[in-house]
């Protein structure tokens, strides 16, 4: 779970140990503040739960490929 | 905050190796990447590689394949890039910065290496 | 490896004015785009990521706008300080590849 430390900065103190469907994802933001302690990616699932996650693992990587790709294909 | 300091300017002959290094503090390197960037004297910005200094994974831009090393303790929160074989076209200002995801929010203060016979 | 085409490679500007630089990629970077600003004989430095988002603590003159293979950096009233050296970079995939800098100049 994110934790907001003041009104401008959120960051992630542990990261999910589960790899979530990206049919279950939303959207993603990255973070990089260095007033955090580690950079960082979290998913916001379709019921707009938020989970932080590491930018390390693979499967972090392809589920924030597959929703640039969604993002930039128009829905017909 | 997030500072990396670099060793200072080296001049070496054609044909040796340079070795440079980056001191980071106020970050765990094991958390990120750590990238070496280089820029010839006008010139623009190259990326050369990258480590995870977590599992000392590496990835380099082929042109830079099999002559560029690069390394990291964690211990003492350094990461290291050996270029070899150098040629004059090698001198440049040479950076390391910091950036898990591709880009490079912190950055050395750059460590110039002029390559010279 | 992606290719990186910056323009103008360089452009003479007054304090106040709007200034523009673009950037295109050789293939959809799906907003993995950076920009960095650098001054002589200083490391470049992070203004915006993702295409859009501003660096903490870069005024917000800057802004970053594109979608697909073209991006553009612009300065909407552009400062002393802002006279500088500015480069594109993707980050879409390894090697990370660098457009060949806007030197924006005094008029």
């Known amino acids: 779970q994110p934790d907001a430390i003041n009104a401008a900065v959120t960051c992630c103190y542990n990261f999910t140990n589960r790899k979530i469907s990206v049919q279950r994802l939303a959207s993603y933001r990255r973070i990089t503040s260095s007033k955090c302690p580690k950079e960082a990616v979290i998913f916001k699932t379709i019921v707009a739960k938020e989970i932080c996650a590491d930018p390390k693992q693979k499967w972090v990587q392809d589920s924030m490929d597959h929703l640039d790709k969604q993002t930039q294909t128009p829905k017909t | 905050q997030v500072q990396l300091v670099q060793s200072g300017a080296e001049v070496k002959k054609p044909g040796s190796s340079v070795k440079v290094s980056c001191k980071a503090s106020?970050?765990?390197?094991?958390?990120?990447?750590m990238h070496w960037v280089r820029q010839a004297p006008g010139q623009g910005l190259e990326w050369m590689g990258r480590?995870?200094?977590?599992?000392?994974?590496?990835k380099f831009d082929p042109k830079f394949q099999g002559r560029v090393t690069i390394t990291a303790d964690t211990s003492t929160s350094t990461a290291y890039m050996e270029l070899s074989s150098l040629r004059s076209e090698d001198t440049a200002v040479y950076y390391c910065?910091?950036?898990?995801?591709?880009?490079?929010?912190?950055w050395g203060q750059g460590t110039t290496v002029t390559v010279s016979s | 490896d992606i290719q990186m085409t910056q323009s103008p490679s360089s452009l003479s500007a007054s304090v106040g004015d709007r200034v523009t630089i673009t950037c295109k990629a050789t293939?959809?970077?799906?907003?993995?785009l950076a920009w960095y600003q650098q001054k002589p004989g200083k490391a470049p430095k992070l203004l915006i990521h993702?295409?859009?988002s501003l660096e903490h603590g870069v005024p917000s003159r800057f802004s970053g706008s594109g979608s697909g293979t073209d991006y553009t950096l612009t300065i909407s009233s552009l400062q002393p300080e802002d006279f500088a050296t500015y480069y594109c970079?993707?980050?879409?995939?390894?090697?990370?590849?660098f457009g060949g800098g806007t030197k924006v100049e005094i008029k």
């Open positions: 910065a910091r950036g898990v995801f591709g880009f490079f929010d912190h």
């Open positions: 106020g970050l765990t390197i094991s958390h990120t990447y």
């Open positions: 480590i995870d200094p977590d599992n000392h994974n590496t």
């Open positions: 293939e959809d970077i799906y907003n993995r």
């Open positions: 993702g295409a859009t």
């Open positions: 970079q993707q980050f879409r995939s390894a090697p990370y590849t």
